[in-house]
Amino acid sequence: EDELQVIQPEKSVSVAAGESATLRCAMTSLIPVGPIMWFRGAGAGRELIYNQKEGHFPRVTTVSELTKRNNLDFSISISNITPADAGTYYCVKFRKGSPDDVEFKSGAGTELSVRAKPSAPVVSGPAVRATPEHTVSFTCESHGFSPRDITLKWFKNGNELSDFQTNVDPAGDSVSYSIHSTARVVLTRGDVHSQVICEIAHITLQGDPLRGTANLSEAIRVPPTLEVTQQPMRAENQANVTCQVSNFYPRGLQLTWLENGNVSRTETASTLIENKDGTYNWMSWLLVNTCAHRDDVVLTCQVEHDGQQAVSKSYALEISAHQKEHGSDITHEAALAPTAPLGGSG
């Protein structure tokens, strides 16, 4: 008879993680007597995957009934494949011997590659908020995919971004890979409702990419604009001064009225008017009894927004000679504007 040949017909096999991999092997002869074994890798460090002779291999089943003598098919199936199973598998015929069986002939090997889906991309933004016209960085991470080839794109409100840097690790061969990308985004005043999207395409996703999103509302701070005006009053001994706080984000805002530099009242914005662009407006007013003042009054609206340094706007309230003759206590109260005089985004 011709000398036994070990035939592994497939050079490579690709399997999705979680599926079973069939590794084919056939012998051309039954001689010599002895077991066949499957190994992953070659050389001294090779890993035994299946031994016809002995052992417990719960994930491995033989494709054919090996107890039939005329069987020359020594293919195996490995269940529940993970990326860690990737490698080159060798079907090896041994000759019965002692103290150990003697390797007689090996197949050429079959490379098993495992297609593993990337994890859902996680997008994270900056730790602190930034104001419009500033650049912030967003990161996108995904792990556990194989093979290494992967495509990552960034979008802002559907528009593809170009200012980003992407790394796939490790650089060399591995059972699975990770991707890390950092995108630089210039903020605009209208970005409260904006989203950045990290989109990942991979062979395992069959054309249906994975997306991770982050809201720019978590990254942006739009400082308010202030406008202090005097409203007309019927009673000539009262002045109504309003402070219109416009187009700010996020909500957190504290307003303080000062009369000639002295704190008159502090209040925290509660019921806000939301603009279409996601920013907020708020109005506070101060009723001033002009009779109580002998001289002109400087009224200051001071706003502390989102824990930042206060901004202020002052208004000089002129006291007429007639009003200066009558002395009276100052009265003031705050009220919410029934409408937002300033709408839209700047």
Epitope: L30, V33, P35, K53, E54, L66, R69, N70
Partner: antibody, heavy 118, light 107 residues
């Protein structure tokens, strides 16, 4: 059903000859290594001879040159030609099938008695 | 030739007992060791191959272990049908050789 049935045993004088047969059923005999094992009365088991799937033959020292193992694929049968028989060859002779990949004995015939006596 | 030595040659035990028979090879035989059971007037029956693998249909009360030169056959709970003679055999190289047998008798 896988089965081995031996025949051809009997009483023979020292120096005589005998041909044992083993008819296999339920499997193809030529696909297996086949063996003859004997057991002298009141004694243990002794391996006698084997024939491999390639026709290679093996014998224990005491029968070498006197016994010949062979098979006939068309009849799915195994044979043991015994010449120059001695009293020490008296035994029950069993036909045995070797296992699939390691030649471990798995199927035994019921045996046939060979008596060498004058 | 490889010599196979069994011990003990005979053994008396009771139903329900756990018994162990040992077999020693004169040289390393890897794990190409088989065990057979034979009852008077009957052909041997194959129990175990490659030291620890049970042949089809053999009850799990039979177990084998060992590698190299020292091997054991254990019967976990003796039943009346288990009283017989047991043989070990090496089949790593020709000539295949058997142990002299261990006769297991009812006490």
């Amino acid at each position: 059903e896988v089965q081995l049935v031996e025949s051809g045993g009997g009483l023979v004088q020292p120096g005589g000859s005998l041909r044992l047969s083993c008819a296999a059923s339920g499997f193809t005999l030529s696909s297996y290594d086949m063996h003859w094992v004997r057991q002298a009365p009141g004694k243990g088991l002794e391996w006698v001879s084997a024939i491999g799937t390639a026709g290679d033959t093996y014998y224990t020292g005491s029968v070498k040159g006197r016994f010949t193992i062979s098979r006939e694929n068309a009849k799915n049968s195994l044979y043991l030609q015994m010449n120059s028989l001695r009293a020490s060859d008296t035994a029950v002779y069993y036909c045995v099938r070797g296992g699939v990949w390691d030649d471990a004995f798995d199927i035994w015939g019921q045996g046939t008695m060979v008596t060498v006596s004058s | 030739d490889i010599q196979m030595t069994q011990s003990p040659s005979s053994l008396s035990a009771s139903v329900g007992d756990r018994v162990t028979i040992t077999c020693r090879a004169s040289q390393d035989i890897n794990n190409y060791l088989a065990w057979f059971q034979q009852k008077p007037g009957k052909a041997p029956k194959s129990l175990i191959y490659t030291a620890s693998s049970l042949h089809s249909g053999v009850p799990s009360k039979f177990s084998g272990s060992g590698s190299g030169t020292d091997f054991t056959l254990t019967i976990s709970s003796l039943q009346p049908e288990d009283f017989a003679t047991y043989y070990c055999q090496q089949y790593v190289s020709y000539p295949y050789t058997f142990g002299q047998g261990t006769k297991l008798e009812i006490k």
